[in-house]
């Protein structure tokens, strides 16, 4: 089953996604795909790295964590309804058959009808949001807190601080991250 | 125009060993997972193997990946199969086929050789 | 392993009949289907990927459905140079594989 995230009409979808490089600047190929992940590849490829930079990447869809230290969580900017469905993070680790695959469930919603206009509730890195931890039976998931509300002003900011946050921590710490080497 | 032709089969005693090629043309090689696949005598078809862009990554059958080793020359724009200690079940007609592209999207062998026929018998 | 089961595994029909070849995997495979069309002593020609999009040449008469398990191949209107084997095969799961086939025979 796939790991559920949620955001708004309009707002910047994140979907996490980590890997531990086996030494520094040692990356791995990444993609991500529209659709879940199928035997090879990230079906329909939206972003890609190498093993020194993003080679490929499609309007809307940037890594904005550092992706030479292994993050290479996914944000997609001004979501709409039809961004709703499944993406598939896979890290292309060389050898026979050893790629990791990540299916993540975006939920789109439409935007909230409120009456403060300067007042935005669920910008993408909202939360509750889902985690998977590793294992191959139905995924495990663990939900963590809401972030309070957020002024319209902060969101442009958010998305910067966030791989540095106690939020990435977590995200690591709850085994979403691959260790190579 | 997209050729893929397979070369190097033939008969050969079981226990024995085989190295099949692929020469491919009319496409940029290296931007496209290669496969083999084989078709037993009067039976169906069987995945073998899968290779990625520069051969860094391979995917196998689990029960011949101890037996064979799928490789590519992205310089010679070639695809290989070596085969080891032979069986007479592996007699087949084998087929190298062009795989997914580098952006995804479209699953399923778009273009495939003529085959080669390796028997195994003594 | 994900199972790829197709029925009938054999068919007469006419030419000029819709013939309709259903294949059923064991697990979601999501739309990773494909289907092929192989005659007596020739490779396996590509006819659907993706579960429904057809490949580059293959006659509008061939036309592929579904998604999660259930998948089908019709052929609306049967021509001569129809009448061939035919495999569907998934892309989702490791190892890749294929139905057992669907000899499709002239009545």
């Known amino acids: 089953s796939e790991v559920e995230y949620r955001a708004e009409v309009g707002q910047n979808a994140y979907l996490p996604c980590f890997y531990t490089p086996a030494a520094p600047g040692n990356l791995v190929p990444v993609c991500w795909g529209k659709g879940a992940c199928p035997v090879f590849e990230c079906g329909n490829v939206v972003l890609r790295t190498d093993e020194r930079d993003v080679n490929y990447w499609t309007s809307r869809y940037w890594l904005n964590g550092d992706f030479r230290k292994g993050d290479v969580s996914l944000t997609i900017e001004n979501v709409t309804l039809a961004d709703s469905g499944i993406y598939c993070c896979r890290i292309q680790i060389p050898g026979i058959m050893n790629d990791e695959k990540f299916n993540l469930k975006l939920v789109i919603k439409p935007a909230k009808v409120t009456p403060a206009p300067t007042r935005q509730r669920d910008f993408t890195a909202a939360f509750p949001r889902m985690l998977t931890t590793r294992g191959h039976g139905p995924a495990e998931t663990q939900t963590l807190g809401s972030l309070p509300d957020i002024n319209l002003t902060q969101i442009s900011t958010l998305a910067n601080e966030l791989r540095d946050s106690r939020l990435a921590n977590d995200l690591r710490d709850s085994g979403a991250t691959i260790r190579i080497g | 125009e997209v050729q893929l032709v397979e070369s190097g089969g033939g008969l050969v005693q079981p226990g024995g060993s085989l190295r099949l090629s692929c020469a491919a043309s009319?496409?940029?090689?290296?931007?496209?997972?290669m496969a083999w696949v084989r078709q037993a005598p009067g039976k169906g078809l069987e995945w073998v193997a899968n290779i990625n862009y520069d051969g860094s990554s391979t995917y196998y059958l689990d029960s011949l990946k101890s037996r064979f080793t799928i490789s590519r020359d992205n310089a010679k724009n070639s695809l290989y199969l070596q085969m080891n200690s032979l069986r007479a079940e592996d007699t087949a007609v084998y087929y190298c086929?062009?795989?997914?592209?580098?952006?995804?999207?479209?699953?399923?062998?778009?273009?495939w050789g003529q085959g080669t026929l390796v028997t195994v018998s003594s | 392993d994900i199972q790829m089961t197709q029925s009938p595994s054999s068919l007469s029909a006419s030419v000029g009949d819709r013939v309709t070849i259903t294949c059923r995997a064991s697990d979601n495979i999501y739309s990773y289907l494909a289907w092929y069309q192989q005659k007596p002593g020739k490779a396996p020609k590509l006819l659907v990927y993706?579960?429904?999009t057809l490949a580059e040449g293959v006659p509008s008469r061939f036309s592929g459905s579904g998604s999660g398990t259930d998948f089908t191949l019709t052929i609306s209107s049967l021509q001569p140079e129809d009448f061939a084997t035919y495999y569907c095969q998934q892309h989702y799961g490791s190892p890749l594989t294929f139905g057992q086939g669907t000899k499709l025979e002239i009545k």
């Open positions: 009319g496409f940029t090689f290296s931007d496209y997972y």
């Open positions: 993706n579960a429904k």
């Open positions: 086929a062009r795989d997914v592209g580098y952006y995804g999207g479209n699953y399923g062998f778009a273009y």
